[in-house]
Amino acid sequence: IVLRPSRVHNSEENTMRALTLKDILNGTFSYKTFFPNWISGQEYLHQSADNNIVLYNIETGQSYTILSNRTMKSVNASNYGLSPDRQFVYLESDYSKLWRYSYTATYYIYDLSNGEFVRGNELPRPIQYLCWSPVGSKLAYVYQNNIYLKQRPGDPPFQITFNGRENKIFNGIPDWVYEEEMLATKYALWWSPNGKFLAYAEFNDTDIPVIAYSYYGDEQYPRTINIPYPKAGAKNPVVRIFIIDTTYPAYVGPQEVPVPAMIASSDYYFSWLTWVTDERVCLQWLKRVQNVSVLSICDFREDWQTWDCPKTQEHIEESRTGWAGGFFVSTPVFSYDAISYYKIFSDKDGYKHIHYIKDTVENAIQITSGKWEAINIFRVTQDSLFYSSNEFEEYPGRRNIYRISIGSYPPSKKCVTCHLRKERCQYYTASFSDYAKYYALVCYGPGIPISTLHDGRTDQEIKILEENKELENALKNIQLPKEEIKKLEVDEITLWYKMILPPQFDRSKKYPLLIQVYGGPCSQSVRSVFAVNWISYLASKEGMVIALVDGRGTAFQGDKLLYAVYRKLGVYEVEDQITAVRKFIEMGFIDEKRIAIWGWSYGGYVSSLALASGTGLFKCGIAVAPVSSWEYYASVYTERFMGLPTKDDNLEHYKNSTVMARAEYFRNVDYLLIHGTADDNVHFQNSAQIAKALVNAQVDFQAMWYSDQNHGLSGLSTNHLYTHMTHFLKQCFSLSD
């Protein structure tokens, strides 16, 4: 299936050019998406090209500027947030990145009624997180690990917590491991639907071991970065959840929400909080051994001024074949009765599907079914449920949006997106206005991305929000590679792959092959999305074939494939890449003397193990910021898939699955090892240990470090990195510069 046909015609051939590395590094062919910032059922905000904040009313067709670029520029604002009562806007400036999601910033409050910034009781700086209440214009913010509340922007703040301490106690924001591996947010506080209550998490990192690394900077002495970071088997953060009445917080104070007894009996995690009504909240908890999750629905007791979580409202989700959930345990989407909910979890056949839970999980009604997976529930209204899945035409790497009518019986299902722009669009996400009156569809490919606005009742397209015309024009004279997504059937395992082929691909010729691998649990690399990136260039200009393969452990194809890697990371992921390479060789157009593999992060781990597999298949390979031993990585992630590194649990496989244990096997391959010295996520320690093992084994290898760079190797390091890797591969494949 050729998903992105080359635009080469003989008459035009001489005017067309290949992609260059410069194109990629300059982002020449990057695309835009349009996500409306919904503020009601029929209105949204959008930042225009000239930086005005514009309010659009779909029904009247009118738009007007609510905040001028001049006001934005006056405080160098890079972001904004309108209060729900539309009286104020916060302006965010001095953005300073911390970890993946977290950052600090300076906030200014602009009063729309008088066109002036609020003076008096200004916010302190820098703030770690700030948000409006869902109704009105109360503000909650986190400063120096403590939470503050303002009844109005010009009011003085009420301090809710007092125990916040850098690297010790985190209130309303997650610590490193919760941010990266559990919540995937920069915040850990949640307003109730009408702003009556504020729930927040407190993370106590007092007993967590600290990772320390040098940040070289420009000073005479490097400074040391210290992060409480629990590695596999180490002491974990202690989490508590509190809820405070935001109207009169001084009387009752923050009330702790009780942890279910079956969870509290041993180490546990808090995984998410969902408000149902102002007086009902749903908390999800997870045992440290992450195969048991408990969803607990708690009610406010007016007489006690506290939160009651009856055992009858505890719902247990357990996996007997792997860990609970996919990458994360799914979150519930509550229906209008405020007690029943929809949730994605494995059905009896081992496929993740939508279930409706009214009383107990055992009595759950399955809403979707089939040998495919429901991926996300976007919205539940009185009569419809909108979700995404990869059902259509049995391609796991696609995403289409479906609507199930839940108001009628039996419920009927309609694919909203399947036939809209079938060739261009096979991978969608959606963004819904209040009550799903309208929604935006964002198509990511395989063709050029396009964002459209739709009527939530009829699904009719109202207008195109962004169609990337400039990109389309710019690509007209570019020889893009061909892409195909197909599958291999091997020993009852289906291996989906994406192959990126040079523009003038000829099956009778031989091409060098580069495998790009990630391969982490619950990941997916083979997706029907548009991209013009480094591997596009390698195919277009350097004539390489690039392949991405989703092997065992990857997502959205059922639990059999997903949980195959449970407790034995580093085995089947590698085997399946090798199996795929052998199949590719059998196709006849691969030069088997010129095969390479590369990956980043988990992909760096897999590529390293593949190179050290002793198969002789790979001539060379690159590992960027690889994990080298699961004992070095974060507890929450690692233990989910590997259990604990203890003798009575899974220590043996922790030891067997290291890259260092295979140092000898690197002797016959060219290996390029790359890492940032300030990687807070996969610590430089991982590559340092690989290098040490290779030196001790007297194995030659190449290495590159990036001083003061984190896991993303951003900025100028990106250019250097891809230039360096390109030289390495061209040398490996004997391609002239």
Epitope: P156, T247, A250, E256, W304
Partner: antibody
């Protein structure tokens, strides 16, 4: 009906110690924040200390920090204030009050006199 | 800390008269964090008003509170004999919570 009954006051020498108790009834004690507020003879009210329902969080006025310890026993519905290194300026009627930083119910108070 | 200054120190009035008590804060205090208490000789304080203007349970409607920012007022529309007492304002916004020095309402 909410009732708070303080006890344990009395005469103590400077540098001495005293433990005040407050027996609570008429409401669910365990989740409630509780406080101690004092009133020197003929003077105004001064907040002294507060404690969360679980006892996990405690708060003190600077004037007593390091000398006074607030605690509670939820099984006995009782609030305590352990007062060490007492000074003449600690002489006051000590009230037990329900609330964190504002107080909807108060006890009758117990008099603490620090004098040599 | 936030200092609350009450005035007058003493208010001498007859039963049936209107009493107006003032409380001024050294810095702005949101209404939600301002309370008034009544204390009679030998008794514990009693919550009268919370949130600057909301009457606590069982408090007669002759008691009313108003104000915002730094200036707050407690008004007793018609003094009853049992209303002669000391009245304290209290803020719970700043930490630590603080009280005014009190206004004594005495019989003229």
């Amino acid at each position: 009906e909410v009732q708070l009954l303080e006890s344990g006051g009395g005469l103590v020498q400077p540098g001495g110690s005293l433990r005040l108790s407050c027996a609570a009834s008429g409401f669910t004690f365990s989740p409630a924040y509780m406080s101690w507020v004092r009133q020197a003879p003929g003077k105004g009210l001064e907040w002294v200390s507060a404690i969360s329902g679980s006892g996990g969080s405690t708060y003190y006025a600077d004037s007593v920090k390091g000398r006074f310890t607030i605690s509670r026993d939820n099984s006995k519905n009782t609030l305590y204030l352990q007062m060490n290194s007492l000074r003449a300026e600690d002489t006051a009627v000590y009230y037990c009050a329900k609330g964190w930083r504002a107080f909807d119910y108060w006890g009758q108070g117990t008099l603490v006199t620090v004098s040599s | 800390e936030i200092v609350l200054t009450q005035s007058p120190g003493t208010l001498s009035l007859s039963p049936g008269e209107r009493a107006t008590l003032s409380c001024r804060a050294s810095q702005s205090v949101s209404r939600n964090y301002l309370a008034w208490y009544q204390q009679k000789p030998g008794q514990a304080p009693r919550l009268l008003i919370y949130g600057a203007s909301s009457r606590a349970t069982g408090i007669p409607d002759r008691f009313s509170g108003s104000g915002s920012g730094t200036d707050f007022t407690l008004t007793i529309s018609r003094l009853e004999p049992e209303d002669f007492a000391v009245y304290y304002c209290q803020q719970s916004l700043g930490y630590p919570p603080t009280f005014g020095q009190g206004t004594k309402v005495e019989i003229k």
